[in-house]
């Protein structure tokens, strides 16, 4: 049971990419406001986004404290202008979110090719190590810092003059591939966490091609 003229939130959904994590829900409020609480399975509830008319709440600051923990959130509904009002059970109406484990569930953001350098018949392709909002010792960790060897990159590459693609993998952020001399190549990368069963892959990076600004060519 809940407060008269308030409705419980529903469709609570976690939206998370590279640990930037937002809880979304419905409905758009009419004469009501929301407050969100978040907790680990064993921890205390912490309130966020107090008395908001938004239908989303950024919980990044809470989940980055320990991305391997499992979190639960709940959204409380209050009548607008009367937030002290409670239901007959003595507490406001609320709805629980699904459980969320950031390390296992955050989506991998679209990677970016930082650079490529050709030396003779080898090309070194470097993937940008994207910064996350996860902190350790007051510094922000990169995606590689957080996932370590759990994160691999798949490189797709092809001659500019042909559509036949090849692929290679790395568990660092660098590839060293063989190419044909005198040919221009295009590159795209995808981030993958092979040990996951869902949300294993990112979208592909933008395509970068030799002969454009990003790379460097050295004939040895």
């Amino acid at each position: 049971s809940g407060t008269t003229n308030t409705v419980a939130a529903y469709n609570l959904t976690w939206k998370s990419t590279n640990f930037k994590t937002i809880l979304e829900w419905e409905p758009k409020p009419v004469n009501q406001v929301y407050t969100v609480q978040i907790s680990t399975k064993s921890g205390d509830w912490k309130s966020k986004c107090f008395y908001t008319t938004d239908t989303e709440c950024d919980l990044t600051d809470e989940i980055v404290k320990d991305v391997k923990q499992t979190y639960l959130a709940r959204v409380f509904s209050y009548p607008a202008g009367n937030v002290e009002s409670t239901g007959s059970a003595g507490e406001p109406l609320y709805e629980n979110s699904p459980e969320f484990t950031p390390y296992l569930e955050t989506n991998l953001g679209q990677p970016t090719i930082q650079s490529f350098e050709q030396v003779g018949t080898k090309v070194n392709v470097t993937v940008e190590d994207e910064r996350t909002l996860v902190r350790r010792n007051n510094t922000f960790l990169s995606l590689r810092d957080v996932f370590g060897k759990d994160l691999i990159y798949t490189l797709y590459y092809w001659k500019s003059s042909s559509s036949g693609k090849k692929t290679a993998k790395t568990n660092t952020n660098e590839f060293l591939i063989d190419v044909d001399k005198g040919e221009n190549y295009c590159f795209s990368v995808q981030a993958v966490i092979p040990s996951r069963t869902v949300n294993r892959k990112s979208t592909d990076s933008p395509v970068e091609c030799m002969g454009q600004e990003k790379g460097e060519f050295r004939e040895i």
């Epitope: 797709y156 692929t167 290679a168 568990n171 063989d178 069963t197 869902v198 949300n199 979208t203």
Partner: antibody, heavy 117, light 107 residues
Amino acid sequence: QIQLVQSGPEVVKPGASVRVSCKGSGYSFTDYNIYWVRQSPAKGLEWIGYIDPYNGLTIYDQNFRAKATLSVDHSTSNAYMEINSLRYEDTAVYFCARDVTSALEFWGQGTSVTVSS
Amino acid sequence: DIQMTQSPASISASVGERVTITCLGSQTIDTYLAWYLQKPGRSPQLLIYAATQLADGVPSRFSASGSGTDFSLTISSLQPEDVATYYCQNVYSSPFTFGQGNKLEIK
């Protein structure tokens, strides 16, 4: 449990085409690449290519680029390989397999394709 | 393209014996190597991934080592059910080539 179930055996004439299907179940179909491999007594295991159901991207061994076409149907969790311009030496057992941590963890039961006039 | 060469092509060993087969890559592939076994009339079955990691359900008598270009698979105590053909596979870069196989028989 995770399964890949392939279509039944085929006997086809030289020059014809054949389509082999591979139905995935028990897992999130778009999250894992589907690889295709063939096996014949003469050449052993040959890697044909793979398709990433997530984005439709295909990678082929250059020897099969003009021979095989890979596709998926998300609505039925089916992967397909069409082999065209069949020759006697294309007689083989064709396998689909699902990737995991840099390997092929689950395999279909194989589809025998016999090219015979 | 990376070629994978396995040796010996066939092995005959006694039950309880220690058996080692090797796989040599024509270029370095770090630890991106897989081992499979295949019994007659069956699909290949994953034994080892990432050069050294046992796949789920694989008995502990199997072990593997190597990185770069040189890899090996060892059965510490051969069992009758280990009769099969063993294949290595480059899973580093396409084409993801297989070795030609090692056929293992019981003496």
